[in-house]
């Protein structure tokens, strides 16, 4: 089915992480020769949606007026030209927040930590969940930062940081999720401000423990559990 045509570009506005009930628009941009655009959702029994191109025919709009769990998932798009269907776009992972009640985020022993010491961020949910994510505000790609290991359902996950440097300072939130769909997240926890003091001679994080690894366009959020953590925060089950 895939032909020699170049792959289109797929993106979501205002973003790919959407709260329940909010609207989102998915865009697929191909070429001026496009006659039709098709949006496929992973493991769906039929094309998710098909649209005629908007003038000047190089893109199509797929509208979701109100985000629900039906729409959460992994998408690709294609366009059809007179010579056939294009290659698939890179995947877009559309994540819905608000599927479960919000967890609680705390810092042990304290959110005030001296550089070089250790701190553990603790994400706790009221009901047992099997995935916990920690995100940092204004990070390059927040949802790629951390995921706890997949295992038996738990009420909490620990995210230890050691040694703490000034780079670790900032505002964090956590989410919880069930393993059957990593595209459905809880409401975000209330924010936790981590304040790092005494940043004299901060040890530089080693490359394997960098805190803010920038993610490329193909590094979509919520890869399968077990992927390399994109943060110095180690993933650990309580």
């Amino acid at each position: 089915q895939a032909g020699p045509l170049p792959k289109p570009t797929l993106w979501a506005e205002p973003g790919s992480v959407i709260s329940w009930g909010n609207s989102v628009t998915i865009w697929c941009q191909g070429t001026l020769e496009a006659r039709e655009y098709r949006l496929d959702k992973e493991e769906s029994p039929a094309p998710w949606d098909r649209q005629n191109p908007l003038e000047p025919k190089n893109k199509a709009r797929f509208s979701i007026p109100s985000m629900t769990e039906d729409y959460a998932g992994r998408y690709r798009c294609y366009y059809r030209s007179p010579v056939g269907w294009s290659q698939p776009s890179d995947p877009l992972e559309l994540v819905m927040t608000g599927a479960y009640s919000k967890p609680t985020l705390s810092a042990l022993p304290s959110p005030l930590v001296t550089s070089g010491k250790s701190v553990t961020l603790l994400c706790q949910s009221r009901s047992p969940m099997d995935t916990f994510l920690l995100i940092k505000e204004r990070a390059a790609h927040p949802l790629l930062h951390l995921r706890s290991e997949h295992g038996a359902q738990q009420h909490q996950a620990e995210f230890p940081m050691s040694p703490v440097t000034s780079v670790h300072g900032g505002t964090y939130r956590c989410f919880s999720s069930h393993g059957f769909s990593h595209y459905l997240l809880s409401h975000p926890s209330d924010p936790l401000e981590l304040i790092v003091s005494g940043s004299l001679e901060d040890p530089r994080p080693s490359p394997t423990r960098s805190v803010s690894t920038a993610a490329g366009p193909e590094d979509q959020p919520l890869m399968p559990t077990g992927s390399v953590p994109h943060s110095g925060l180690r993933r650990h089950w309580e």
């Epitope: 959702k41 039929a46 094309p47």
Partner: antibody, heavy 122, light 109 residues
Framework: QVQLVESGGGVVQPGRSLRLSCATS????????MHWVRQAPGKGLEWVAL????????YYADSVKGRFTISRDNSKNTLYLQLNSLRAEDTAVYFC???????????????WGQGTLVTVSS | DAVVTQESALTTSPGETVTLTCRSS?????????ANWVQEKPDHLFTGLIG???NRVPGVPARFSGSLIGDRAALTITGAQTEDEAIYFC?????????FGGGTKLTVL
Amino acid sequence: QVQLVESGGGVVQPGRSLRLSCATSGFTFSSYGMHWVRQAPGKGLEWVALIWFDGGNQYYADSVKGRFTISRDNSKNTLYLQLNSLRAEDTAVYFCARDVISMVRGVPFDYWGQGTLVTVSS
Amino acid sequence: DAVVTQESALTTSPGETVTLTCRSSTGAVTTGNYANWVQEKPDHLFTGLIGGIKNRVPGVPARFSGSLIGDRAALTITGAQTEDEAIYFCALWYSNHWVFGGGTKLTVL
């Protein structure tokens, strides 16, 4: 109005082949996916195969995988099912049913044909 | 392989509300199973009723509605009528294939 008419059924010996057809009218065939579903005598429904609107994707039940082939000719508004290596347990009435244009437009299995009987017997 | 289970038979009276359910052997039915409901009347007369858990086929009376109840898909007939006497099949999608349930014979007495 939407019409689906199956043909090609009959009595066939085990191990032999048969080709079923489903002629359609009343809708834009090339825009819709299509299914084959079967019902053994006195039994429930068993889904057999699905083909997308452009023929680009096909899916099969494990029980027929490697033996049956679903195809379509959009210029003739016709759906086909090639049945090879037939077994006694393939005896059933075979129905074609319409799928959707897309998941956000339409409902799968909305229209059905009247069926064609395939009997596999020596 | 997944098995889809339905009540084998249910009886209701005209005007009553009746709910048919559809259970999956793999766990809870989710939106990703795109639950469908099909009605069979005598002489192999099949009609689609509901798709994607809750979307009604155009022309199907509003008394038919689909939902998820607990870990099952459900078809509810609110104010059953004598012409609703039929066999009802649910179908669930499992990533790359559909599976039909065994059907529920609904009697409206």
